[in-house]
């Protein structure tokens, strides 16, 4: 931002009223008036170029310094060419000297040269030659100097002529301030520019109404340079929740809009399934039946729990059931749907029912499922099972009602035994099997059926109460098809896979484990 100039002295604007001191009186500098465009123009002029040893002084009135630390002095003046005068006037000069003196009081007409300190020799960029002077085309020069730091109550400026032809049309003395500024929603007060060129005064800003420093952000600060320019902004303020930036202010969100935190973003329209918000809202309340999860951003529409899984099937496969379902028709407006599967078993004889989580095995943990199928194993035969699949989303916990679908299945068979070959010889095969422990109590006997591969006309059956059998009197180097089936009071259980086991050839005799 441009520096603000505070004028302490303006000769041109004073209309000849200042009454500066001249020394010697009347013989050197003197006030002159000229009329331009019907307006009087005043100037202090001196032109004693033909006489040697000129030492003419012009002293301003005493200027109260006030709060200024460094002053700027702008001079507008004309200087005539020494060659305008006969023989170039050997004593003629084309410069004058600028001085200042600080004091705590006005010395009035008591002028003492020795109190003055030279600021600089003032030389024109352009001199006015005779032809220009006579044609009224004077060359106006503008020079600026600065002095500081000043410490006394006031000061004088003085102009020393040593034999030039000078007209001083304007003397303007001012100091600079960094102007009052609104930036980054922070207010910076008008600040006096410092006096030392390298130094920058650090100025703290204050957030405008309804603006705050964001958490973890830096307090707003700026630096006021010597020339009255604001530099190096640090930190900023942001409009608080419920307010948005409009030009250099924070304005309350309009009805139907909201802003949930201090940020640079504007107010947002209330999302779907919310009630119209009042002015300055930080969030929009949900419509009845709709909710916002704790982690949901305020910008997200309000949502509701999902409907039940749309379609549920339970397909029994021995002592296993595969549950499959399709997503709810109404997701509630959310994508974070998960499923929970629970299991209840009922004894057909007694009609008694109870939870079965402890006795069954799921293909993956039954709570927080994201897929739409699961396999349940280790089911007991001749038992009725009811499976419940509940759909939940991020707001389900905010309501008491549940969204679920159930499917029932009766298990009439035991699970197929898992069969393995324990050993073999040229004439025998030793086979063992296993079924889940919960089903073992229901098994009366196990039936082992075997036959030569490729012979579909004859097969052999062995029954046993144990979990293994050795099949003897087999042909060497022959492949047999073996299947094991559990027998229960209610009938046959599920049969195992048909396994192919081969006896050893005569060369490799001996009972070797496979």
């Amino acid at each position: 931002a441009q520096g603000k100039e505070v004028v302490l002295l303006d000769f041109a604007a004073a209309g000849g009223e200042l009454g500066w001191l001249t020394h010697p009186y009347g013989k050197g500098w003197d006030l002159m008036q000229n009329i331009m465009n019907d307006m009087p123009i005043y100037m202090y002029s001196v032109c004693n170029v033909m006489s040697g040893d000129q030492d003419n002084w012009l002293r301003t009135n005493w200027v109260y310094r006030g709060e200024a630390e460094r002053i700027f002095i702008e001079l507008k003046f004309t200087v005539r060419d020494c060659n305008s005068f006969p023989g170039g006037a050997s004593s003629c000069k084309e410069t004058f000297n600028l001085y200042y003196a600080e004091s705590d009081l006005d010395y009035g007409t008591n002028f003492q040269k020795r109190l003055f300190t030279k600021i600089d020799t003032i030389a024109p960029d352009e001199i006015t030659v005779s032809s220009d002077f006579e044609a009224r085309h004077v060359k106006l020069n503008v020079e600026e100097r600065s002095v500081g730091p000043l410490t006394r109550k006031g000061f004088y400026l003085a102009f020393q002529d040593i034999g030039a032809c000078v007209a001083l049309l304007s003397v303007r003395v001012y100091y600079k301030k960094c102007p009052e500024l609104l930036q980054g929603l922070a207010h910076f007060p008008e600040t006096i520019a410092g006096s030392d060129a390298p130094s920058l005064a650090t100025v703290a800003g204050t957030c405008v109404d309804h603006a705050v420093v964001p958490p973890g952000g830096e307090e707003p600060r700026m630096h006021c340079a010597v020339d009255g320019e604001w530099l190096v902004p640090i930190g900023q303020c942001l409009c608080q929740a419920g307010y948005e930036k409009v030009e250099d202010a924070c304005q309350a969100c309009s009805p139907g809009f909201f802003k949930f935190e201090a940020s640079e973003s504007p107010c947002l329209e209330c999302p779907e399934h919310t009630l119209p918000s009042p002015e300055g809202a930080t969030s929009c309340e949900c419509e009845e039946g709709f909710f916002r999860a704790p982690q949901d951003p305020a910008s997200m529409p309000c949502t509701r729990p999902p409907s039940a899984p749309h379609y549920l099937t339970a397909v029994g496969m021995g002592a296993k059931v595969e549950l499959r379902w399709t997503p709810p028709q109404d997701s509630g407006g959310r994508e974070d749907i998960v499923y929970s599967v629970t299991c209840e078993q009922c004894w057909p004889e007694s009609g008694e029912c109870g939870p079965c989580e402890a006795s069954v095995r799921y293909s993956e943990p039954p709570h927080g499922l994201t897929r739409t199928s699961v396999t349940v194993s280790d089911l007991e035969p001749h038992m009725n099972y009811t499976f419940t699949v509940e759909a939940r989303n991020g707001v389900s916990g905010l309501v008491t009602s549940r969204s679920f679908r159930t499917a029932s299945v009766s298990i009439n068979q035991t699970e197929p035994p898992k069969v393995r070959l324990e050993g073999r010889s040229t004439t025998s095969l030793s086979v063992s099997w296993s079924i889940p422990p919960p089903q073992q109590s229901r098994v009366w006997k196990y039936e082992v059926t075997y036959r030569k591969k490729g012979d579909s006309n004859s097969y052999n059956v062995r029954r046993t109460e144990g979990f293994s059998v050795t099949l003897d009197d087999l042909a060497p180097d022959t492949t047999y098809l073996v299947q094991v089936q559990a027998l229960t009071q209610e009938g046959q259980g599920a049969g195992s896979k048909v396994h192919e086991f081969q006896t050893l050839s005569p060369e490799g005799s001996g009972n070797l484990a496979v």
Epitope: G16, E17, G19, T22, Y25, G26, K27, D30, L31, M32, Q33, N34, I35, Y42, Y44, S45, C47, N48, V49, M50, S51, Q54, S84, F85, P86, T109, R136, C165
Partner: antibody
Framework: QVQLVQSGGGLVQPGGSLRLSCAAS????????MHWVRQAPGKGLEWVAV????????YYADSVKGRFTISRDNSKNTLYLQMNSLRAEDTAVYYC?????????????WGQGTLVTVSS | SELTQPPSVSVAPGQTVTITCQGD??????ASWYQQKPGTAPKLLIY???NRPSGVPDRFSGSSSGTSASLTITGAQAEDEADYYC????????????FGGGTKLTVL
Amino acid sequence: QVQLVQSGGGLVQPGGSLRLSCAASGFTFSSYAMHWVRQAPGKGLEWVAVISYDGSNKYYADSVKGRFTISRDNSKNTLYLQMNSLRAEDTAVYYCARASVGATGPFDIWGQGTLVTVSS
Amino acid sequence: SELTQPPSVSVAPGQTVTITCQGDSLRSYYASWYQQKPGTAPKLLIYGENNRPSGVPDRFSGSSSGTSASLTITGAQAEDEADYYCNSRDSSGTHLTVFGGGTKLTVL
């Protein structure tokens, strides 16, 4: 209106004294340098003396230096010229005049003039 | 330092007349011009570059060049018959201000 009214002239013997007065009205007397200009009978104008607006600075023509004293009383809006050791060549109409700007004029307001005759 | 004027100049009514003023001071400072009619105090006509106080007719004008200043009356009238004096600051430092010897203008 703006005017200067003079008084105090007359006949005086050589070596004698006379005090001329110039009463100002219609302007801020204390803001202006004031001059005395004289005109000998049938001759041109001759500058005599100047006094600054506050009375702190005074200058005289060589012909009157040491004999004449210019003064002012800003409280009475009056300019004075005390003339001592008068000579025959001091015989003239004396005018008071206001310097419109600065010390040296131009002279924009003039008194009506007062005749001083130095004769035995 | 002195300012030199012609003692007398004449002009026919309605004609233009120029009165000159010569002097070293005029290189440095502008001349002022005064009109004096018999038995009255001088009256300021022109000062500075070419400035006329209010009430002075615009037939009066001033100019300067080098060591010379001029007063020009364009369309002289009978009432312009008077003595005319130039005046300037003294650039030599000897005097504060100097007058020319005066010019008697006769309107024929």
